[in-house]
Interface confidence: medium
């Protein structure tokens, strides 16, 4: 998957820090204060499609033979830059008794884009 | 995740057979001879986005709270409606020297679809 | 300090459909599990479903399956539950409790609503 | 579904006196994770239900401590080590391991 880095347009992952104080969910969550959760933007042209990143290659890559192929409904259906791979990052939290709790949280991180 | 009924033109998974022959994958794929792969279609209003589906959660969750309160860059993002659990299959097929293979190929079938 | 604060109670006729809201103050909203549960007069506790805004994900017991709508609006910290067909079987006080954040269905309920009355009669 | 059952039904107690209720599951509630994914909640007079204890024996914030949960797998108990006028009401537990989550029938205890 591509970073960034301001010179293309092209599907690729955004660096983005995320403030816990700033979505107001710093009533329950303890550590970290924030961490860096990325996003992914950019273009992707029928040719790229179902070519980046690794979690949907099979499935979009079968649907991609039908896009190219202008086969209906996939010629009309828009192909979108989304996260291809999440990372779980580890997160010190109170739970509703108020006992604190240490536990790996899957699927906040994005490491990779791709064109769905 | 929402089944596609023809009634609601919001983010849903829409039943899909892929023939391997009609995409010329018959000549290394023995077994099936197509399967239900599936795929996501609709709308994803802001109200909806990073709310439905499973593997994008906390991420979506997280940037979405950006996107309600018109935070740039979220606020021109477009949500995506996306595969976000998808299931593996099992496949009889050739490799590269003419052995047969049985494997469970990850991410074939669309299971639930969400807005990123 | 924590609180869910239900709809008024309703009055309905066999086969119509109730919507109940429970608004949350107090916290955050989507990292937690909110389910419904019922109780019939001088009967048990019955749980009917819920609702893990975070992920979207929605769960119904099979008995209320096809009549029960469990949704949640994460702008106003309101979890919903709309039962449809009603019968005079589903009279009952309908509460809503707030599981544990980040816990899926496998949640304890600390915080429970104050219970809205549902009452199906001709 | 996971069945839940309780006994005894109706528990009378004298003020002062222990009290214990018994819950049973028609199949395990131990996770591979090493907990018991079983609650008991008391729901007084006129009330909403309240949570006292969680995961078989952990006891919930602000619960007076002579309340406690025990057991593993599918038989789970809770004890009032000395009760009180104010422990009057039902008891239930649930299960959580797997949806739908179900509820014992309720133990209703009152004062002799």
């Known amino acids: 998957g591509l970073e960034c880095d301001g010179k293309v347009n092209i599907c690729c992952k955004k660096q983005f820090f995320v403030s816990f104080k700033d979505i107001g969910w710093n009533d329950w969550i303890i550590a970290p204060s924030g961490y860096h959760a990325n996003y992914c933007e950019g273009e992707c042209p029928s040719h790229i499609a179902g070519t980046s990143g690794s979690s949907l290659s099979f499935h979009s890559t079968v649907i991609n033979h039908y896009r190219m192929r202008g086969h209906s409904p996939f010629a009309n259906l828009k192909s979108c830059c989304v996260p291809t791979k999440l990372r779980p990052m580890s997160m010190l939290y109170y739970d509703d008794g108020q006992n604190i709790i240490k536990k790996d949280i899957q699927n906040m991180i994005v490491e990779e884009c791709g064109c769905s | 995740g929402l089944e596609c009924d023809g009634k609601v033109n919001i983010c849903c998974k829409k039943q899909f057979f892929v023939s391997f022959k009609d995409i010329g994958w018959n000549d290394w794929i023995i077994a099936p001879s197509g399967y239900h792969a599936n795929y996501c279609e609709g709308e994803c209003p802001s109200h909806i986005a990073g709310t439905s589906g499973s593997s994008l959660s906390f991420h979506s969750t997280v940037i979405n709270h950006y996107r309600m309160r018109g935070h740039s860059p979220f606020a021109n993002l477009k949500s995506c409606c996306v595969p976000t659990k998808l299931r593996p299959m099992s496949m009889l097929y050739y490799d590269d020297g003419q052995n047969i293979i049985k494997k469970d190929i990850q991410n074939m079938i669309v299971e639930e679809c969400g807005c990123s | 300090q924590v609180q869910l604060v239900q709809s008024g109670a309703e009055v309905k006729k066999p086969g119509s459909s109730v919507k109940v809201s429970c608004k949350a103050s107090g916290g955050s909203f989507s990292p937690y599990t909110w389910s419904w549960v019922r109780q019939a007069p001088g009967q048990g506790l019955e749980w009917m479903g819920g609702i893990i805004p975070i992920s979207g994900t929605a769960n119904t017991a099979q008995k209320f399956q096809g009549r029960v709508t469990i949704t949640a609006d994460e702008s106003t910290s309101t979890a919903y539950m709309e039962l449809s067909s009603l019968r005079s079987e589903d009279t009952a006080v309908y509460y809503c409790?707030?599981?544990?954040?980040?816990?899926?269905?496998?949640?304890?309920?600390?915080?429970w609503g104050q219970g809205t009355l549902v009452t199906v009669s001709s | 579904d996971i069945v839940m059952t309780q006994s005894p039904l109706s528990l009378p107690v004298t003020p002062g006196e222990p009290a214990s209720i018994s819950c049973r599951s028609s199949q395990s509630l131990l996770h591979s994770n090493g907990y018991n994914y079983l609650d008991w909640y008391l729901q007084k007079p006129g009330q909403s239900p309240q949570l006292l204890i969680y995961?078989?024996?952990n006891r919930a914030s602000g619960v007076p401590d002579r309340f406690s949960g025990s057991g593993s797998g599918t038989d789970f108990t809770l004890k009032i080590s000395r009760v009180e006028a104010e422990d009057v009401g039902v008891y239930y537990c649930m299960q959580a391991l797997q949806t739908p989550i179900t509820f014992g029938g309720g133990t209703k205890v009152e004062i002799k």
């Open positions: 995961l078989g024996s």
């Open positions: 409790a707030r599981g544990g954040p980040l816990s899926g269905w496998r949640a304890s309920y600390y915080y």
